[in-house]
């Protein structure tokens, strides 16, 4: 019989034969043959492996560094990782939650709409019109531009969402 | 080595006055939004005041408002919190903290007692 060039759903093609993949938490010891299975093996304490694969080695999971603020949220499993999170108080800097922070700061052309607490983090808006931010700040709301006419000047470089107007005087030469 | 040696705590009475200080160094001081934070016995992490890198805006918790002063000294690479009358309800462990604010700049913290 001809050879096959794709094979189903949880196989995978070697040697010009389809061999069946590891399941979930096992990984591969030896491709199948035309007279054996496909050989796997339990992944060891602290290793996963989460999809049907042919991987010789297993995963790692991931350690929730104690000295980065981090601590098991979930255990992890031969087909699981190990998920992190903060301590009480902390908050993730990202969605895998590798490091924590205190809060996390609001960039420049954006202000803080609500200061962290301990169960949520910073809440930033971005600076309407009128209004700017020149600076990584985790309580400063965005400040109003200067008004140069109440100062009895003129704006000579229009504000933006990071700087603020900067202003001049009049021009008194009138034509 | 980023560093903040928080001092200054101590045991005193209701009414009283403390002024902690937060030593930094391993990084420039002058420019960065500073923070203290405070943790009671057996409570969350709670934010209390901060200021800017310009040392021109400053924050307080309503629970501090009027009675704590927050301030810096750029040339000392030193940040301040002025404590007055003090109450019961601010016993606990006092931190500073910086940008980014992450745990592993995390200092040991100065114990405050108010108790008579």
């Known amino acids: 019989p001809e050879p096959p060039t794709a094979c189903r759903e949880k196989q995978y093609l070697i040697n010009s034969q389809c061999c069946s993949l590891c399941q979930p938490g096992q990984k591969l010891v030896s491709d199948c043959t035309e007279f054996t299975e496909t050989e796997c093996l339990p992944c060891g304490e602290s290793e996963f492996l989460d999809t049907w694969n042919r991987e010789t080695h297993c995963h790692q999971h991931k350690y929730c560094d104690p000295n980065l603020g981090l601590r098991v949220q979930q255990k992890g499993t031969s087909e699981t990782d190990t998920i992190c999170t903060c301590e009480e108080g902390w908050h993730c800097t990202s969605e895998a939650c590798e490091s924590c922070v205190l809060h996390r700061s609001c960039s420049p052309g954006f202000g803080v709409k609500q200061i962290a607490t301990g169960v949520s983090d910073t809440i930033c808006e971005p600076c309407p019109v009128g209004f700017f931010s020149n600076v990584s700040s985790a309580f400063e709301k965005c400040h109003p531009w200067t008004s140069c006419e109440t100062k009895d000047l003129v704006v000579q470089q229009a504000g933006t969402n990071k700087t603020d107007v900067v202003c001049g005087p009049q021009d008194r030469l009138r034509a | 080595e980023v560093q903040l040696l928080e001092s200054g705590g101590g045991l005193v009475q209701p009414g009283g006055s403390l002024r902690l200080s937060c030593a930094a160094s391993?990084?420039?001081?002058?420019?960065?939004e500073m923070w203290w934070v405070r943790q009671a016995p057996g409570k969350g992490l709670e934010r209390v005041s901060?200021?800017?890198?310009?040392?021109?805006?400053?924050y307080y918790a309503d629970s501090v408002k009027g009675r704590f002063t927050i301030s810096r000294d750029d040339s000392k690479n030193t940040l301040y919190l002025q404590m007055n009358s003090l109450r019961a309800e601010d016993t606990a462990v006092y931190y500073c903290?910086?940008?980014?604010?992450?745990?592993?700049?995390w200092g040991h913290g100065t114990l405050v007692t108010v108790s008579s």
């Open positions: 391993g990084f420039t001081f002058a420019g960065y």
């Open positions: 903290a910086k940008e980014p604010y992450s745990y592993d700049y």
């Open positions: 901060a200021i800017s890198g310009s040392g021109g805006s400053t």
